[in-house]
Interface confidence: medium
């Protein structure tokens, strides 16, 4: 039975050229987290593996930094970075938990962070 919930940074916005932290937090479960994947649509951005540590996909190495924690930092943002991002927690014995973040990259200097929300 999957009892956990993923809390994410929700809908967020940031300025073009700036950076943003994508964060998810898994709670309400004692399951072991064996790996966390960060994906944009079906593209793998990064993996944090319990045994091996971080791996950043080669095509994102220049603009993606691991952390803080199990989060991911996106740098040198462009308008093309606008879209859905997913944190996928692989756990035992629960299985797979997925959290969603929507990032909007704005041309203007007015970029407000959205509220946090729960994904069951």
């Amino acid at each position: 039975m999957m009892t956990g919930t993923i809390e994410t940074t929700g809908n967020i916005s940031a300025e073009k050229g700036g950076s943003i932290i994508l964060q998810c937090h898994l709670s309400s479960t004692t399951a072991q987290v064996t790996q966390v994947n960060w994906e944009q649509q079906d593209q793998l951005l990064a993996i944090c593996n319990a045994d091996l540590g971080w791996h950043i996909s080669p095509s994102f190495k220049d603009r993606v930094a691991p952390g803080p924690g199990l989060g991911l930092t996106l740098q040198s943002l462009t308008v093309n970075d606008t879209g859905e991002y997913f944190c996928i927690y692989h756990t035992y014995p629960d299985g797979t938990y997925t959290g969603r973040i929507f990032l909007e990259v704005l041309e203007s200097s007015v970029a407000e962070h959205g509220a946090r929300f729960q994904i069951p």
Partner: antibody, heavy 119, light 107 residues
Framework: EVQLVESGGGLVQPGGSLRLSCAAS????????MSWVRQAPGKGLEWVAT????????YYPDSVKGRFTISRDNAKNTLYLQMNSLRAEDTAVYYC????????????WGQGTLVTVSS | DIQMTQSPSSLSASVGDRVTITCKAS??????LNWYQQKPGKAPKLLIY???NLQTGVPSRFSGSGSGTDFTFTISSLQPEDIATYYC?????????FGQGTKVEIK
């Protein structure tokens, strides 16, 4: 070319023990989660055990928990399955598989080794 | 445990036919559904991962779709070399479970 070659199968009496090995080549073995999956004669597939890349985490279904132990030697590129207290229902072909944890899919399988538990 | 129910359990079709196999999960598994092909006397081979993604080197006549509890596997034009048993497998929750298999034969 990725290769997984199982060995160690054979005939064993109920209550007995057997150790299966899987020699891996053609990829960086220490970077991959590995599993054993079995198939009873004429039946479907059943997941048996999984071990994380560094060996820190092991997972089993209830049907084998406490009887089977999965382990690995990354220096030797070898995966193991120690099977104790064997039962007739453990008779099957045992496949060594490589997991792509990013997909939760098994992308390479060995040819299998047959384990027969019978008196 | 999550139960995976495949249908049909077997089918017979002609070369060139469109073949469809369904897989139903007993609870929501999102897109964590894989399809494998097992030819007689051989090990299974991964064809489709995460419901709809074609594994590298697999012919494009194979495809998959679905999410949640209902999934479909399709061979758009059946070829003689496609004679095999096809299995779905869920990767949402431990223990990972497989469907009972669908045996595909040529008429």
């Amino acid at each position: 070319e990725v290769q997984l070659v199982e060995s160690g199968g054979g005939l064993v009496q109920p209550g007995g023990s057997l150790r299966l090995s899987c020699a891996a080549s053609g990829f960086t073995f220490s970077s991959y989660t590995m599993s054993w999956v079995r198939q009873a004669p004429g039946k479907g597939l059943e997941w048996v055990a999984t071990i994380s890349s560094g060996g820190s985490y092991t997972y089993y279904p209830d049907s084998v928990k406490g009887r089977f132990t999965i382990s690995r030697d990354n220096a030797k590129n070898t995966l193991y399955l120690q099977m104790n207290s064997l039962r007739a229902e453990d008779t099957a072909v045992y496949y060594c598989t490589r997991w792509l944890l990013s997909l939760y899919a098994m992308d390479y399988w060995g040819q299998g080794t047959l384990v027969t538990v019978s008196s | 445990d999550i139960q995976m129910t495949q249908s049909p359990s077997s089918l017979s079709a002609s070369v060139g036919d469109r073949v469809t196999i369904t897989c139903k999960a007993s609870q929501n598994i999102n897109v964590w559904l894989n399809w494998y092909q097992q030819k007689p006397g051989k090990a299974p081979k991964l064809l489709i991962y995460k419901a709809s993604n074609l594994q590298t080197g697999v012919p494009s006549r194979f495809s998959g779709s679905g999410s949640g509890t209902d999934f479909t596997f399709t061979i758009s034009s059946l070829q003689p070399e496609d004679i095999a048993t096809y299995y779905c497998q869920q990767g949402q929750t431990y223990p990972f479970t497989f469907g009972q298999g669908t045996k595909v034969e040529i008429k």
